[in-house]
């Protein structure tokens, strides 16, 4: 029977800068029941607080609701593991909520084959930003990435779309059915999951780009 091993806070994520959750990995339990507590203080403060919500994020997590979440302030947090034989502490983790946003996938993905008379045909892809993200304030810049592939192909073709919410693709295989998905990330932050796939049938007379 031993004191617990050192835990590690390994991930923090926020869907929208208004709430966030951090998760830790327990160390060894020393063969005894072990209690975990997360404490934190904000940059410039000395007053320590305990995690406000150990439930919402699931096991080994701490969830910070709206009233506990401040943007532009660094949180300094650590996890304490305690059993009958002693305690151990994680390294301190510095967290700025602005940098841990992982948005929901983009919405309303629409894909259409355009065949203008005077130009080469192209695939036109359009989407909307996720609803929880408020782009109007200027606090967010979302970057987008598109991936597509013929239905039976193994490899995805990836295109970086920057900040635009529509994109044209010229080089496609005629007669193939394509899957198209889009994802987004804040300029500092994490990629969302890919959106649900949209399928598009490329006409047989679609001319490949030179």
């Amino acid at each position: 029977q031993l004191p617990p091993g050192k835990p590690e806070i390994f991930k923090c994520r926020s869907p929208n800068k208004e709430t966030f959750t951090c998760w830790w990995r327990p160390g060894t339990d020393g063969g005894l029941p072990t209690n975990y507590s997360l404490t934190y203080h904000r940059e410039g403060e000395t007053l320590m607080h305990e995690c406000p919500d150990y439930i919402t994020g699931g096991p080994n997590s701490c969830h910070f609701g709206k009233q506990y979440t401040s943007m532009w302030r660094t949180y300094i947090m650590m996890v304490n593991a305690t059993n009958q034989m002693g305690s151990s502490f994680s390294d301190e983790l510095y967290v700025d909520v602005t940098y841990i946003v992982q948005p929901d996938p983009p919405l309303e993905l629409a894909v259409e084959v355009k065949q203008p008379e005077d130009r080469k045909p192209y695939l036109w892809i359009k989407w909307s930003p996720p609803t929880l993200i408020d782009l109007k304030t200027g606090w967010f810049t979302l970057l987008y990435e598109i991936r597509l592939k013929p239905e039976k192909a193994a490899e995805w073709e990836i295109h970086f779309a920057g900040q635009q919410t529509e994109f044209k693709i010229l080089s496609l295989h005629p007669g193939q059915k394509y899957l198209v998905q889009v994802r987004c990330k804040p300029d500092h932050g994490y990629w969302s999951a890919w959106s649900p796939a949209t399928f598009i049938q490329i006409p047989s007379d679609f001319t490949m780009n030179d």
Epitope: T74, L93, Y94, D96, Y190
Partner: antibody
Framework: EVQLVQSGAEVKKPGSSVKVSCKAS????????MHWVRQAPGQGLEWMGE????????NYNQKFKDRVTITADKSTSTAYMELSSLRSEDTAVYYC?????????????WGQGTLVTVSS | DIQMTQSPSSVSASVGDRVTITCKAS??????VAWYQQKPGKAPKLLIY???NRYTGVPSRFSGSGSGTDFTLTISSLQPEDFATYYC?????????FGGGTKVEIK
């Protein structure tokens, strides 16, 4: 204990490439951005670029954009910096440096440095 | 790119002295400034982040202040182990840039 252990010194010819490695231990590699900073002999520090090992998303200093490639191998917890078209002014100590937290780019842990000498 | 201009480039001081190093940004950087200490042949060590916050384990004799474009690192009572070169760094906008360094030497 957090450690960043870099590969050994290199001597390279002008026009060639160098690839420096940085093996991380003592923490979850994918949690923090990794940066590369260089220091020419007797000179100051110069930031080259950064990578998020969780998805290999990277940003570069435009000064090096066409010559530097930063990669990360999650399976070995190792970051790499490759610099191509070397010239004599690239002679420097190259450091990997871990982001201080989940936040802006200040650097709390540094590798020991790798001296790259470019000479004909 | 944002230029970070440090002054002085070197300073001679004695143990127990108060040493002040300044860093001026070429444009507004808020409080997105860090300070590092570097000894010969070693990697830099973080002292201060967000202009005024001491990093874990850094002695209280080191303090940082400033916002906007003007920043200061103060060593309140210089110790023998503090003789080194000090660098400021801005992380407000890409590319992240460092000052030219200030060497603190023994008088």
């Amino acid at each position: 204990e957090v450690q960043l252990v870099q590969s050994g010194a290199e001597v390279k010819k002008p026009g060639s490439s160098v690839k420096v490695s940085c093996k991380a231990s003592g923490y979850t590699f994918t949690t923090y951005w990794m940066h590369w900073v260089r220091q020419a002999p007797g000179q100051g520090l110069e930031w080259m670029g950064e990578i998020d090992p969780s998805d290999s998303y990277s940003n570069y200093n435009q000064k090096f954009k066409d010559r530097v490639t930063i990669t990360a191998d999650k399976s070995t917890s190792t970051a790499y910096m490759e610099l191509s078209s070397l010239r004599s002014e690239d002679t420097a100590v190259y450091y990997c440096a871990r982001n201080g937290g989940l936040g802006p780019a200040w650097f709390s842990y540094w590798g020991q440095g790798t001296l790259v000498t470019v000479s004909s | 790119d944002i230029q970070m201009t440090q002054s002085p480039s070197s300073v001679s001081a004695s143990v127990g002295d108060r040493v002040t190093i300044t860093c001026k940004a070429s444009q507004y950087v808020g409080t997105a400034v860090a300070w590092y200490q570097q000894k010969p042949g070693k990697a830099p060590k973080l002292l201060i982040y967000s202009a005024s916050n001491r990093y874990t384990g850094v002695p209280s004799r080191f303090s940082g202040s400033g916002s906007g474009t003007d920043f200061t690192l103060t060593i309140s009572s210089l110790q023998p182990e503090d003789f080194a070169t000090y660098y400021c760094q801005q992380y407000s906008s890409y590319p992240w840039t460092f000052g030219g360094g200030t060497k603190v030497e023994i008088k």
